[in-house]
Interface confidence: low
């Protein structure tokens, strides 16, 4: 029976010292990675392609340059820093902000003006990917050209100027229905975030050929939900201290508990020239002992464990977070493929 | 000692029947999820916001519509189908295809023509997100306007026409350096993929004001890597049979092995109106017994286990794949946030 044979093996190997069994784990992991890569790329064998052919076929072109350049950015150097990606807290992707009351009376020429937007301190100017101001234009009676102008309120200048232009656009409207129009305000928003005191609000105008303003700025009856608003897309990669996570050890460690150990896979070392990038990557592996409730996989696991004693012969040292690698490779058919291979890097080990 | 107390607890609870401890697991999981959501969104308490205020504040606008509409698509119904996302094989994101020999002699007016592109059957027309033809334009000596024309070869028509236009563009070039120019060919590529027999190749022209062709189609000496090529971005969501994965059970199951059980979290049921979408989601949980090497987490784990017996008191039933949920919610500051909360859905359970 294969299973009992395996268990016997395990018992025999249990006599090895820590260094020996770590070495075994390491070489097994490298072999496993080679098998996985071919299997995950659905290749039966490694493509047979020479360095010369590669040099000849590789386009010297922007999209390829971009793909190769990404490898400088994407190396797994998280073990070197004290901060790591926070995969516990929510990541914010889009923030929709409604106009709000300004801290001062936002009136110009005796009339209230729209709009003033307050921003959460959470939004950092360098994290803004896209910022769109959405305005609703009321329907028109006849086909017409509409001149949309977004002005930024500024502190009055010597000549009395209260505004500076942000964006203006011209659009054709057909009768029958109002439309939502979006305007790029990323630069303005970034400036406001850098210098909050410069955010005095904006004015929106959308004049048709007869000078009528079609922009809904102060919604009338039946116009609920047609206020202007800001849609801000942000990249949110929160960090948190690595102390919140699993242990990291090095090859010389005497740590007996469950730990992540470094392991670099070098494709050139085993002659895989068909992989264009990366030439090597940090795969890592897990090794060590587990005590009950030591380093749970998810923050609430202890609750589940308390209620779920059966089937818990004791937790095991296993990857609790794995990440993919991006790979640029020849598939042996004069095609260069850029793809993502899942679960190739051990980011964290834990007892679960 | 807290640990021994916990172990004692575990032994007492071990006497419960399967249904009771599953029920305990389930209620613990719901409470844990509530705590997690607030904690992951960095909220101390649930925002106090009424349905009326929500109705009043929600913009009736395209970006919000899109975000809400996503919830129809994103429901976790994977348990209902026999195919599930394949998170083992590589996903292809970009394919760079070089011109190749046509199956027939691609000559027009006695001259060889560029270019013919062969496509892997792997590319499905409806998975193409972007397709760009990249051409390299040789440097010019003086500032000039270049007329780029991409023609598609077709079966000769009655009037002898051999071409139909795909794209034409006009661009200004300054002396000193050649440039890479990209042209959108998504529609043509999709047609070729739908009807491969219509793919007879293309002709590329890039004429300056004097009628000289600046496009590198057949690279001369020193022009290695300057061939035209196609850059195709695809969405690749390979599927594989759920049999390759962990077990799925229902509430009435008598399965004792490690299994995933359904659990729906209903935000409305506990009065969380501040969550705009989803109103409910399938969270699921893991429960059951583990035998050695039953349902390993990653395909190569058995190799590592053989070499790593220490600290493996036996594997445990734990989530081996978790996924995030996207959430649209009010943060209590007149802002609507669309974000991703990690590790909120148990997709698969296994012994690891």
């Amino acid at each position: 029976n294969e299973n009992s044979e395996q268990k016997e093996n395990v018992e025999k190997e249990g006599l090895c010292n820590a260094c020996t069994w770590r070495q075994n784990t390491k070489s097994s992991r490298i072999e496993a990675i080679k098998i996985q890569i071919l299997s995950k790329l659905r290749l039966e064998t490694a493509p047979n392609i020479s360095k010369d052919v590669i040099r000849q076929l590789l386009p010297k072109a922007p999209p390829l340059r971009e793909l190769i350049d990404q490898y400088d950015v994407q190396r797994d150097d998280s073990s070197d820093g004290s901060l790591e990606d926070d995969d516990y807290h929510a990541t914010t992707e889009t923030i929709i902000t409604m106009p709000t009351e300004s801290d001062f009376l936002m009136q110009v020429d005796g009339k209230p003006k729209c709009c003033f937007f307050k921003f959460s301190s959470k939004i950092q100017y360098n994290k803004v990917v896209k910022a769109q101001l959405w305005i609703y234009l009321r329907p028109v009676e006849t086909p017409t050209t509409v001149f949309v102008q977004i002005l930024r309120l500024i502190k009055p200048m010597k000549d009395g100027t209260r505004y500076t232009g942000i964006r203006s656009l011209k659009l054709d409207m057909n009768p029958g229905t109002g439309i939502w129009q979006s305007i790029d305000v990323k630069t303005v928003l970034q400036n406001w975030l850098k210098q909050p005191e410069s955010n005095l609000g904006i004015e929106i105008k959308a004049l048709d050929e007869n000078g009528h303003d079609l922009a809904v700025t102060f919604p009338g009856p039946g116009e609920d939900g047609l206020n202007p608003f800001l849609e801000v897309k942000v990249t949110d990669t929160p960090k948190r201290s690595r102390r919140d996570f699993g242990l990291d050890c090095d090859e010389h460690s005497t740590e007996s508990r469950c730990c992540r150990y470094p392991l670099t896979v070098d494709f050139e070392a085993f002659g895989w020239d068909w992989i264009i990038a990366p030439k090597r990557y940090k795969a890592n592996y897990c090794s060590g002992e587990c005590e009950f409730v030591f380093l749970q996989k998810y923050p609430h696991t202890h609750l589940v464990h308390q209620a779920n004693p059966r089937g818990s012969a004791g937790p095991c040292c296993t990857p609790t977070k794995m990440s993919p690698i991006n790979m640029l490779y020849f598939n042996g058919k004069e095609q260069i493929i850029y793809g993502k291979i899942p679960a190739m890097v051990v980011d964290r080990c834990g007892c679960s | 000692n807290e640990n021994s107390e916990q172990k004692e607890n575990v032994e007492k609870e071990g006497l419960c029947n399967a249904c009771t401890w599953r029920q305990n697991t389930k209620s613990s999981r719901i409470e844990a999820i509530k705590i997690q959501i607030l904690s992951k969104l960095r909220l101390e308490t649930a925002p106090n916001i009424s349905k009326d205020v929500i109705r009043q504040l929600l913009p009736k606008a395209p970006p919000l519509r899109e975000l809400i509409d996503q919830y129809d698509v994103q429901r976790d119904d994977s348990s209902d189908g026999s195919l599930e996302d394949d998170d083992y094989h590589a996903t292809t994101e970009t394919i760079i295809t070089m011109p190749t020999e046509s199956d027939f002699l691609m000559q027009v007016d006695g001259k060889p023509k560029c270019c013919f592109f062969k496509f892997s059957s792997k590319i499905q027309y409806n998975k193409v997100v972007k397709a760009q033809l990249w051409i390299y334009l040789r440097p010019v000596e003086t500032p000039t306007t270049v007329f780029v024309q991409i023609l598609r070869l077709i079966k000769p028509m009655k009037d002898g026409t051999r071409y139909t236009g795909i794209r034409s563009l006009k661009l200004d070039m300054n002396p000193g350096t050649g440039i890479w120019q990209s042209i959108d060919v998504k529609t043509v590529l999709q047609n070729w993929l739908k009807q491969p027999e219509s793919n007879l190749g293309i002709e590329i022209k890039a004429l300056d004001e004097n009628g000289h062709d600046l496009a590198v189609t057949f690279p001369g000496p020193g022009e290695d890597g300057l061939n035209p090529f196609l850059e195709v971005k695809v969405t690749d969501t390979p599927k594989r049979s759920r049999r390759d994965f962990g077990l799925d059970c229902d509430e009435h199951s008598t399965e004792s092995r490690c299994c995933r059980y359904p659990l729906t979290v209903d935000f409305e049921a506990f009065g969380w109106d501040w969550i705009i979408a989803p109103k409910r989601y399938k969270a699921n949980y893991c429960s059951g017994e583990c035998e050695f090497v039953f349902l390993q987490k990653y395909p190569h784990t058995h190799l590592v286990h053989q070499a790593n017996p220490r600290g493996s008191a036996g594997p445990c039933c734990t989530p081996t794949k978790m996924s995030p949920i996207n959430m649209l919610y009010f943060n209590g500051k007149e802002q609507i946030i669309y974000g991703k909360i990690p590790a909120m859905v148990v997709d698969r359970c296994g012994c690891s």
Epitope: R138, P139, V140, E141, N174, P175, G176, G220, P221 | K60
Partner: antibody, heavy 119, light 110 residues
């Protein structure tokens, strides 16, 4: 409270002109389209016409030449006038907020008024 | 002229059953989604159920859902309730101020 109410004659003779009024409350006609829809007894709904918030008029093809729609924003009223009435025009006439088929138009209707065309 | 055809003319089902009503337009509605569904009970004005082909109107129970785009649309009532006995109309918009209703489907509860 937002309401729409149709009013006008209950009986009209053939060839005569029908005038119906839709009086709204809680609605600003300068920001709202108003539609007219009719329904013959035991039959389905039939679109008649629209006056847009800005005063543009759109009419069903069968009603062109016979139908006039106007509004008096200050009185909160929309008026439908249909000439050359025929017994086939016997129907319940409704006014509705917005345009049924566009966005959430048709989310509010009057109770309708039954108009009989008979000599 | 635009023709909107609803089928079936009458649908007779028991409580708890799933009802599927169809609406086909002779030409594509504007933006592929200018289509609404209305419910009408005798002696009452129509009530908006679905707009933009698939968006549930405010206050409408979630057992109602809409799907489709272009020329073919469906209204589904996942689990019929006695109060769902009514006539259901689709309404399409075609741009340029052109609108049309279907002839209606009567839903009866057995």
């Amino acid at each position: 409270q937002v309401t729409l109410k149709e009013s006008g004659p209950v009986l009209v003779k053939p060839t005569e002109t029908l005038t119906l009024t839709c009086t709204v409350s809680g609605i600003d006609l300068s920001h709202t389209d108003i539609s007219w829809v009719r329904q013959a007894p035991g039959k389905g709904l039939e679109w008649v016409g629209i006056i847009s918030y800005a005063g543009s008029k759109y009419k069903a093809s069968w009603a062109k030449g016979r139908l006039t729609i106007s509004k008096d924003t200050s009185k909160n009223q929309v008026v439908l006038t249909m000439t050359n009435m025929d017994p086939v025009d016997t129907a319940t006439y409704y006014c509705a907020r917005g345009v049924p088929a566009y966005s959430h138009g048709g989310d509010l209707w009057g109770q309708g008024t039954l108009v009989t065309v008979s000599s | 002229d635009i023709v909107m055809t609803q089928s079936p003319a009458t649908l007779s089902l028991s409580p708890g059953e799933r009802a599927t009503l169809s609406c086909t337009s002779s030409q594509s509605v504007y933006h592929a989604n200018w289509l609404s569904w209305f419910q009408q009970k005798p002696g009452q004005p129509p009530k908006l159920l679905i707009y933009w082909a698939s968006t549930l109107a405010y206050g409408v129970p979630s057992r109602f859902s809409g799907s489709g785009s272009g020329t073919d649309f469906t209204l589904t009532i996942s689990s019929l309730q006695p109060e769902d006995a009514a006539t259901y109309y689709c309404a399409g918009g075609y741009g340029g101020g052109r609108y049309a209703f279907g002839q209606g489907t009567k839903v009866e509860i057995k």
